[in-house]
């Protein structure tokens, strides 16, 4: 297993609709054809997997159908979007990149992006 540098923004504020996007950029030492990207959430020392996708270079990222993540890739950059976020989802979102094929296997973990989320103000009840 060889180490690889991964860069991501330090902080992002989600939109009022609970959507946060950020770029995860990795310094690929070789010509990888198969890449796996995992988003981890760290909150209060607990780390949980948010979503993961494996893609072939030049192809779209494919997350599971029920995933809250979507993404696109361009060269050594992955543009990740996380949807359906609530205030309670505020936390550090860490990008983990693995170069799966061809060998050698490379692993890179970013410092994390602190995503802040604020629940929208509830709409006042209407009389209709």
């Amino acid at each position: 297993c060889k180490a690889m540098h991964v860069a991501q923004p330090a902080v992002v504020l989600a939109s009022s609709r609970g959507i946060a996007s950020f770029v995860c950029e990795y310094a690929s030492p070789g010509k990888a054809t198969e890449v796996r990207v995992t988003v981890l959430r760290q909150a209060d020392s607990q780390v949980t997997e948010v979503c993961a996708a494996t893609y072939m270079m030049g192809n779209e990222l494919t997350f599971l159908d029920d995933s809250i993540c979507t993404g696109t890739s361009s060269g050594n950059q992955v543009n990740l979007t996380i949807q359906g976020l609530r205030a309670m989802d505020t936390g550090l979102y860490i990008c983990k990149v693995e170069l799966m094929y061809p060998p050698p296997y490379y692993l890179g973990i970013g410092n994390g992006t602190q995503i802040y989320v604020i629940d929208p103000e509830p709409c006042p009840d209407s009389d209709f």
């Epitope: 923004p9 902080v11 205030a87 410092n111 994390g112 602190q114 802040y116």
Partner: antibody, heavy 117, light 107 residues
Framework: QVQLVQSGAEVKKPGASVKVSCKAS????????ISWVRQAPGQGLECMGW????????NYAQNLQGRVTMTTDTSTNTAYMELRSLRSDDTAVYYC??????????WGQGTLVTVSS | EIVLTQSPDFQSVTPKEKVTITCRAS??????LHWYQQKPDQSPKLLIK???QSISGVPSRFSGSGSGTDFTLTINSLEAEDAAAYYC?????????FGPGTKVDIK
Amino acid sequence: QVQLVQSGAEVKKPGASVKVSCKASGYTFTDYGISWVRQAPGQGLECMGWISAYNGNTNYAQNLQGRVTMTTDTSTNTAYMELRSLRSDDTAVYYCARVGAGDWDYWGQGTLVTVSS
Amino acid sequence: EIVLTQSPDFQSVTPKEKVTITCRASQSIGSSLHWYQQKPDQSPKLLIKYASQSISGVPSRFSGSGSGTDFTLTINSLEAEDAAAYYCHQSSSLPFTFGPGTKVDIK
């Protein structure tokens, strides 16, 4: 090294607007946010809100909603805070600070805004 | 909104004495609590981040502890240059909030 340099002191009349700038250097501007904090004479620190320089999204203090606008210009690495309909109790020193993963590690030198008729 | 309360409001201390300032959050904020020092006519300066993590360049006499709702800033062996206001600040959830501050002066 990281620096936040703010614009100079302002004297405004009640009802006017003020726009304070905060020029950042020494780091990748869009990787962080910029918060704005004010301090009335002899008082504590009050969070006015912040802006994510990465995407321009903002979060304002509820008591200032509708009167404050925070923006960034990523071409010049500068953040701006505009406060409208100024009142005498808006007289304060206004600070910008870099928002990282939690702590605010760098602050501007402060801008004194005086509202007086 | 998470409300932070600090005690005491004011403390007058002799040099070399130990100072303890407490900060209480209205709900659990984990360790997302930071301490700032502000000297007269100066910008605030980060002293301690994430409840207990030290900051490069800050004297080792400053330390922090706590998690959840109760936090403490300790100044061991106070020096004359430590006369300042001290603020706690939470970054656990929006909106960000500060405590009202504790003013420390030298007897």
